[in-house]
């Protein structure tokens, strides 16, 4: 990880944020689709 001078902490935090963002987008898309289909 960048020649080992960094901890993996920040990368882990950012990966978790990316997963949250992705899930929010997917769930939001599904919700919009459900509303549209009603």
């Amino acid at each position: 990880h960048s020649d080992g001078i960094f901890t993996d902490s920040y990368s882990r935090y950012r990966k978790q944020m990316a997963v949250k963002k992705y899930l929010a987008a997917v769930l939001g898309k599904r919700y919009k689709q459900r509303v549209k289909n009603k």
Epitope: F6, T7, S9, S11, K15, M17
Partner: antibody
Framework: AEGGLVKPGGSLKLSCKAS?????????ICWVRQAPGKGLEWIGC????????DYANWVNGRFTLSRDIDQSTGCLQLNSLTDADTAMYYC??????WGQGTLVTVSS | AQVLTQTPSSVSAAVGGTVTINCQSS????????LSWFQQKPGQPPKFLIY???KLASGVPSRFSGSGSGTQFTLTISDVQCDDAATYYC?????????????FGGGTEVVVK
């Protein structure tokens, strides 16, 4: 990075180059500023890999982050500058390794 | 917006003594533990000391220790040395989807007598 004196309403581009190591794709280049005699203030971060960005709400579109992974460089574009933007601007890899900072003075 | 409140704003300690700096967050820090501490001396950039509330960064003396979770965090400097005279900042990591990803505490100046 080149700082310097800028007039109110002016623009400036700061750059930050990694030295002694290469930037990997999961690395983030963050920017923090510090007004004279004041505390640290987070500006934003950009992912070296995908170029994804996050900004502090107060930035309000005035500042823009960019990066060139091949050149191991991050940039901060400062626009519509005011006296309140006078500060030392730091880049920080993963908010762990910090650059020496560059002083930006906004004055007429 | 989130707020990181650091107390005290200034503290004086004798060489060999102990200093405790508090950092209170509202809302809670992401995952309860993503909080870092930095040391800054005049004319220098901040130096990374502690991450994830209690893990010591490489090369940092064991006299420095961090603790806490959720909203309350503490940096303790034991056996204080003259070289520890500096301003210390906490940095919070938050859920970027609801607030700014990061915020710094206001800083605590440590004066060594």
């Amino acid at each position: 990075a080149e700082g310097g004196l800028v007039k109110p309403g002016g623009s400036l581009k700061l750059s930050c180059k990694a030295s002694g190591f290469t930037i990997s794709r999961d690395y983030w280049i963050c920017w923090v500023r510090q007004a004279p005699g004041k505390g640290l203030e987070w500006i934003g971060c950009i992912s070296a890999g995908g170029g994804s960005t996050d900004y502090a709400n107060w930035v309000n579109g005035r500042f823009t982050l960019s990066r060139d992974i091949d050149q191991s460089t991050g940039c901060l574009q400062l626009n519509s500058l005011t006296d309140a933007d006078t500060a030392m601007y730091y880049c920080a890899g993963n908010l762990e390794i910090w650059g020496q900072g560059t002083l930006v003075t906004v004055s007429s | 917006a989130q707020v990181l409140t650091q107390t005290p704003s200034s503290v004086s300690a004798a060489v060999g003594g102990t200093v405790t700096i508090n950092c209170q967050s509202s809302p809670s820090i992401y995952s309860g533990a993503f909080l870092s501490w930095f040391q800054q001396k005049p004319g220098q950039p901040p130096k990374f000391l502690i991450y994830e509330a209690s893990k010591l960064a490489s090369g940092v003396p064991s006299r420095f220790s961090g603790s806490g979770s959720g909203t309350q965090f503490t940096l303790t400097i034991s056996d204080v040395q003259c070289d520890d005279a500096a301003t210390y900042y906490c940095l919070g990591f938050y859920d970027c989807s609801s607030v700014d990803c990061h915020a710094f505490g206001g800083g605590t100046e440590v004066v060594v007598k």
